[in-house]
Amino acid sequence: FERTRSLQDPCSNCPAGTFCDNNRNQICSPCPPNSFSSAGGQRTCDICRQCKGVFRTRKECSSTSNAECDCTPGFHCLGAGCSMCEQDCKQGQELTKKGCKDCCFGTFNDQKRGICRPWTNCSLDGKSVLVNGTKERDVVCGPSPADLSPGASSVTPPAPAREPGHSPQ
C-alpha cells in the first residue's frame, strides 16, 4: 500500500528543504527564504524561528532545519529548545516577580539561578556547625559535640555531598 501511495503521490518525492507546490502541478519547490522543511513530502515549509531580544542565534536556520536560540549573557534558558529565557541573579539571591532579592536569613543560593534553600540542620545528623552559613553558602557541619571530648579526633571525614535541593530542612 505504501509503495502504491508513493507512486500515486508525487509529493512523497519532495526532499527536505523543499515543499510540494500545489500551485505548480505539485512540483517540488525550494523553501522560500526564512523557512524550512525538515522532512520530505511536506506541502508547506515552516517559518524559521527568530532569535530576538534576549534570545541569541545559536544555530542559523537552513532550508532543512530550524534556527536554534540561546539566551544573552545575564539570562539562562528554560523549556524545551530554549523556549524561554529567565534572568540570572547573583549568588545569595533568588528571582521573584519583583526581580532579584537577597536570600532570607537561614537560606542560601550558591548559583545564579534557582531558589534560596535552607541551611543544612547539622543537629539532625548529630553534628555541630563548624562554619556558619551565609546567603551564598550552606553551613559546614563538623564533628558532634561528643566527638570533641578529650582524646577524640577533632575532625570527622566529610559526609557524601548531598544533591542540591535535598539538604534536610
Epitope: V54, G79, S83, M84, C85, E86, Q87, T96, K97
Partner: nanobody, 123 residues
Framework: EVQLVESGGGLVQPGGSLRLSCGAS????????MFWFRQAPGKELEWVAN????????YYVDSVEGRFTISRDNAKNSLYLQMNSLRAEDTAIYYC????????????????WGQGTTVTVSS
Amino acid sequence: EVQLVESGGGLVQPGGSLRLSCGASGFTFSNYWMFWFRQAPGKELEWVANVNQNGSEKYYVDSVEGRFTISRDNAKNSLYLQMNSLRAEDTAIYYCARGGEGYSDSHYGTDVWGQGTTVTVSS
C-alpha cells in the same frame, strides 16, 4: 504570528519625558504578564518593570522606581511605559516582552520579545 512591536523612542533632554508603547498581536494579550527590559550601550540586558494580567500588580527595578510607570490596555492589546525625569543613564534600547506560560507559578521566564525602540537622553 505572535508579535510585539515597540514604538515611542527618541531623543529627549535630561529631565524630559517619553511614553513607550508596545502593540501585541497573535495571542490573547490579557492572559500574560508583560515586561519592559532595556539594554544600555555596552551593558547587559536589564529588567525594568513588569505588570500582571489585569494591571493590578506592578514591579520596578530600583533605579526607575517613582520615575517610570508601566501600564496596559487589554482592550487595545497594548503595553506602555511612561518615563519621566529621564537621566542620561536611561539611554538604552527598550524591549517589550511576554512572560512565558505559567509565569510566576513555575518560572520567571519570558518567551516573546519585540525588536526594541531606542531612547537617547542627551542635552
